[in-house]
Structures are given as structure tokens and as C-alpha cells.
Amino acid sequence: MSSKYPRSVRRCLPLWALTLEAALILLFYFFTHYDASLEDQKGLVASYQVGQDLTVMAAIGLGFLTSSFRRHSWSSVAFNLFMLALGVQWAILLDGFLSQFPSGKVVITLFSIRLATMSALSVLISVDAVLGKVNLAQLVVMVLVEVTALGNLRMVISNIFNTDYHMNMMHIYVFAAYFGLSVAWCLPKPLPEGTEDKDQTATIPSLSAMLGALFLWMFWPSFNSALLRSPIERKNAVFNTYYAVAVSVVTAISGSSLAHPQGKISKTYVHSAVLAGGVAVGTSCHLIPSPWLAMVLGLVAGLISVGGAKYLPGCCNRVLGIPHSSIMGYNFSLLGLLGEIIYIVLLVLDTVGAGNGMIGFQVLLSIGELSLAIVIALMSGLLTGLLLNLKIWKAPHEAKYFDDQVFWKFPHLAVGF
């Protein structure tokens, strides 16, 4: 089997990616400048550390989490890095254009990079549903469309529903999940005879996927607290996220054992279920008033995640063509919805407590926000899926799905790789 890209992709990818990069450089040249008002060097370091946590989550965490395929681990990690690098650049520009541009040039701060990294994370969550079935040229399209859709969604939600940075970014879980699932639905589904082994997991890649899950587990509190307004809110968010992910680990491992007839633990269940609590508390992590609530939420999320991992892959494999080990899409879609429901419940309690008398209105607004996120995710996902089906991108043949050798040069083409 040749390790070269098909000739057409060799022409298409470098030209497409480098032209795009040149365009981004020109946009940065004409429209951006650094924040000149930075006074506090200690503050700079603290702010950078949050951004660094997010980058570790994205590059190592999500990069390795998606690397469990027997013959697609290299591509998973490297393609994730490629998408992150491209996504961050476009997200910085887009956020600047949408929020600052009327007042002149886009001012780039460390916060801009933090926000852009979180936007790019959306793509890395979504792509789990399609990795192995698309080439880099197609992934470039996916990055551009998804980051643009998320940026516009956040702006619309901010303007119409008056939500803050944290709240409109926390729709990322639901948005990314439904975007990825709708893209996957558009792509060719059946795996031809003889290629089924490629979408199975192997021990060493599974270990690297577990490493990715561990990095995400460690840094999830940083993600959930990154955009909050006050030190107290950030502290609450860190604590609540930590309690939730701690409980979801215990639930994931014991629940996985419980779900197996022989009491064995499934690597696939554990990879995603350990993160369940972090996703479920994301929206309301700063609002949860006591640890036990966060822990209960982590428990419920862990159970939902294990249950979903047990019963949903069959359905997702048939309908969407998503392999059994790519469970992030439906996992995040269920847990994201759980998180949004918890937020609505807490919002009702807040409205009652404030003696506001407009509970129905507040709930309606929150449901409207969530519905808008799902609708935009589905529509932009379907659009992306249709774009990715165009012949121009020279998509890999179904027989070469989940195969590193299509994309990478290996000194020895070992079949069992």
C-alpha cells in the first residue's frame, strides 16, 4: 500500500493550506495590533497560565484522546494539532471582527488567545466523529466553517440573550457535539469488507488515549473557570468542576465494570466517562452553591456516559457511521444537554430568590438560547458535511478509512501497525 497522498491531494492540500495561511497573515498585518496597555507583568504570567492550560487540553488532551484507533493514531494527534493551530488564528480574527472591529483595529490580548483556543476546542470535539474518514484539506474546511459558526452563534447569543462570555462559550459542548454528529451523518457511512479492523482500538493507542483523558481531566477546571468575572466565581468553578470530575472517574470505572457481564472495565467507556462531570457542570459550575451538588451531578453524568457508551454506539454506527470508539459526539451531546438543564433549574431558583416574578420569561430565554445553539450547530454541520462531500477535496476512499499509511511516510510499512 503506498504511503503517499493521492496526487490530486498533494496538489490540493499544500496550495489550499498555504494560501489560507498567507491570507491569515495579511489579515493580521492589516487589521490587528497588540494590546499596548499592559502594565502588570505578574498579571501577564497568571493570565498566560490559564491560556497554557487550555492549549495543553487541546493539543495533548483532545489530541491523544482521539488517538485510540489501531491504524489511525498518528493522524489523530497530528491532525488535531493542525486544526488547533489553524482554528486559533481564525478565531482570534473572527472574534476581533465581530466584537471590536467597528472601533478600528482588532486588539490582541492574552484573553483573545484564551477565547480563540476555546473556540478551536469546539472543532477538536466535533472532529472525533469524522476523524479517519476525511483528509487534511477537508479538515481545513471544517475548521473554517465551525469556528465561524461558533463565533457568530456567540455574538448572536451575547446580543440577543444578553449572556456573558462564560455562558455563551459553555454552549460549546452541545454545539460541538451536534455539529460533529451532523457532519458525520453526511459522510459516506458503510465500511467496506476487510477494513473493519482499522476502526478497532489497540493497546498502545488506547494507552495514549487514556493519557489524553488524564490531561483533560487535570485541566478541565481551568476550562470551566477561564471566562468567569470574579475571583469568587472562578474559585467556585474550579472546586465544583474538580468534585464533579473526581466523582465521574469513580462512577465511570465502577459503572463500566457493572455494565460488563464478566465485570470487566471497558477502555472506551473510561476514556470519555472520566470527563463526564466536567461537561455536565460546565454551564453552571460557578453557580453550584455546595460541593455535594457538584458531586451528585458528576455521579449522574458518569452513569449517563457509561450508559450512553453501552447502548448508543450501535445506533450511531448504523445511522451516522461513527465507530464504536468515537463516543465523544453523543457523550457530549447528552451531557451538554444535562448541563444546560441544570443551568435552567438554577436560573429558576435564582429568579425566585430575587423575587423577580419573571420565571417563565427567564426559562424561555434559556431554552431559546439552547435551541439556537443546536439549530446553528445542525445547520452549519450539515453545510460542512455537504461541502466535504465535494469531489474537489479528493476524500479518502472508504477502503482507506482509518489508515495512517494514506497520510504518513513510514520507513517500514508494517501491516500490523
Epitope: 499592559l38 502588570d40 498579571g43 497568571a46 493570565s47 490580548t109 492574552l110 484573553f111 484564551r114 444578553n162 462570555y165 468575572r229 470574579s230 475571583p231 469568587i232 466565581e233 453557580l287 452553591p289 438554577l346 436560573l347 431558583l349 435564582d350 429568579t351 425566585v352 430568590g353 430575587a354 423575587g355 423577580n356 419573571m358 420569561f361 427567564q362
Partner: antibody
């Protein structure tokens, strides 16, 4: 005792720049958001800008966007307002104020308010 | 942007009177409303925050109420030192606008 002292005001020509400072003492400056509010002679209060506790987020009133920059140095307990392209109608007393927040019993979202104000510094924009 | 409209713009009352000032928001601000008092030549002082909580050190004759879009500042028994301009402010969403102010004079 919480104290906020504004300095840097004065007479400046239209189109020119000025930088205001607000020195804070008596509290942990790096834990609080800070605001600038102005008041034209004989007029009401007009909110100008806010900066979050860590300097990560800044918001401005539309009329000053792109011309004014709020910043802070937490190591020096100082808030700044860099004002460029000043206009005659921006003649005002500029106050800095500390933002505090509270969790009202029965609610879950923090509510914000300005609990301490400086005495203000007068900026006169005139040719 | 959220607009705040105070009424009346000015009023004159006698010592001992009960005085009410209202503040109406252009949309629901969910109790993110504060009241400030400013005397001539002084900086504003916080009186009431979160619509109804009295700031420590503020006289107990001041009280606040309201929810949604309509809020009220009440002085139960007017004192000579209450002569000032009162402002409401929303902190629901930036820009954090102030009302135009209500000037209170003592007869």
C-alpha cells in the same frame, strides 16, 4: 480604610491625549473589578469603562470605544484610563470606583455594584 | 443598551415627608440595580444595591424595592441632610448605564 485617589486631570486641547491614574489602598486591589465614571459640569453620571480583576476583560461605553483604554497594574495597585483624541464634550470630572459583588440569599448569580468611589479628577478639553 | 428612566427629574419635599423615586429599565434587569446619592461637590455614595439591600452605613430610612423592569427608592422620613441628587444604575449588562438623576430639594 478603602481609598481611591485619582490624578492626571488637567486642561488639554481637543484631539490630544491624557492619562488618568487611580491609586488604590486599604483593600486587596487585585481581587476587584474597577470602573471609570464621568460627570460633565452640571450633568448626570455617565459610566465610561470597566476592567475585570485580572485585566482580562474590558468594556467601554460606545462613545469612547477605540479612543479610551482602561488598564490596571495589580502590582502597583493602580488603575489607568488612557484617553486619546479627546473632545470638548468630554470635559468632566472623572471618578474611579471599586466594583463589589454579592450573592443575595436565595439567588445563585452574583450581583455587582460600585461600593467605593474616589473624589474625582477634573479633565477640561478646551482650545 | 439598557436605558434607565428616573422619575421625577426633580422634586421638593418637607422634612418628615415620605419620598419615592422610581427607576424604569428598558428591559428586565433581574434586580441588578443600585442606587447612589450624590451631594454637590462630592463623589457619589452607594445607598442601595441589588434593588433592596441597604449599604452598611447608610441610614435605615432609605429602602429599595422592585423587580423586573420597575424599581423604587423610598425615603421614609425625609431629613435635611438628604438634599442631594439620586441616581439608579444597572449592572445587568455593559454598558452599565445610570439613570438621568433625581434632584431632591428640602422645602
Amino acid at each position: 480604610e478603602v481609598q481611591l485617589v485619582e490624578t492626571g486631570g488637567g486642561v488639554v486641547q481637543p484631539g490630544r491625549s491624557l492619562r488618568l491614574s487611580c491609586a488604590a489602598s486599604g483593600f486587596s486591589f487585585s481581587n476587584y473589578g474597577m470602573h471609570w465614571v464621568r460627570q460633565a459640569p452640571g450633568k448626570g453620571l455617565e459610566w465610561v469603562a470597566v476592567i475585570w480583576f485580572d485585566g482580562s476583560i474590558k468594556y467601554y461605553v460606545d462613545s469612547v470605544k477605540g479612543r479610551f483604554t482602561i488598564s490596571r497594574d495589580n502590582s502597583k495597585n493602580t488603575l489607568y484610563l488612557q484617553m486619546n483624541s479627546l473632545r470638548a464634550e468630554e470635559t468632566a470630572i472623572y471618578f474611579c470606583a471599586r466594583e463589589n459583588s454579592v450573592l443575595v440569599p436565595g439567588t445563585i448569580r452574583r450581583r455587582y455594584y460600585l461600593d467605593y468611589w474616589g473624589q474625582g479628577t477634573l479633565v477640561t478639553v478646551s482650545s | 443598551d439598557i436605558q434607565l428612566t428616573q422619575s421625577p427629574s426633580s422634586l421638593s419635599a418637607s422634612v418628615g415627608d415620605r419620598v419615592t423615586i422610581t427607576c424604569r429599565a428598558s428591559q428586565s434587569i433581574s434586580s441588578y440595580l443600585n442606587w447612589y446619592q450624590q451631594k454637590p461637590g462630592e463623589a457619589p455614595k452607594l445607598l442601595i444595591y441589588v434593588a433592596s439591600t441597604l449599604q452598611s452605613g447608610a441610614p435605615s430610612r432609605f429602602s429599595g424595592s422592585g423587580s423586573g423592569t420597575d424599581y423604587t427608592l423610598t425615603i421614609s422620613s425625609l431629613q435635611p441632610e438628604d438634599s442631594a441628587t439620586f441616581y439608579c444604575q444597572q449592572t445587568y449588562s455593559p454598558p452599565y448605564t445610570f439613570g438621568q438623576g433625581t434632584k431632591l430639594e428640602i422645602k
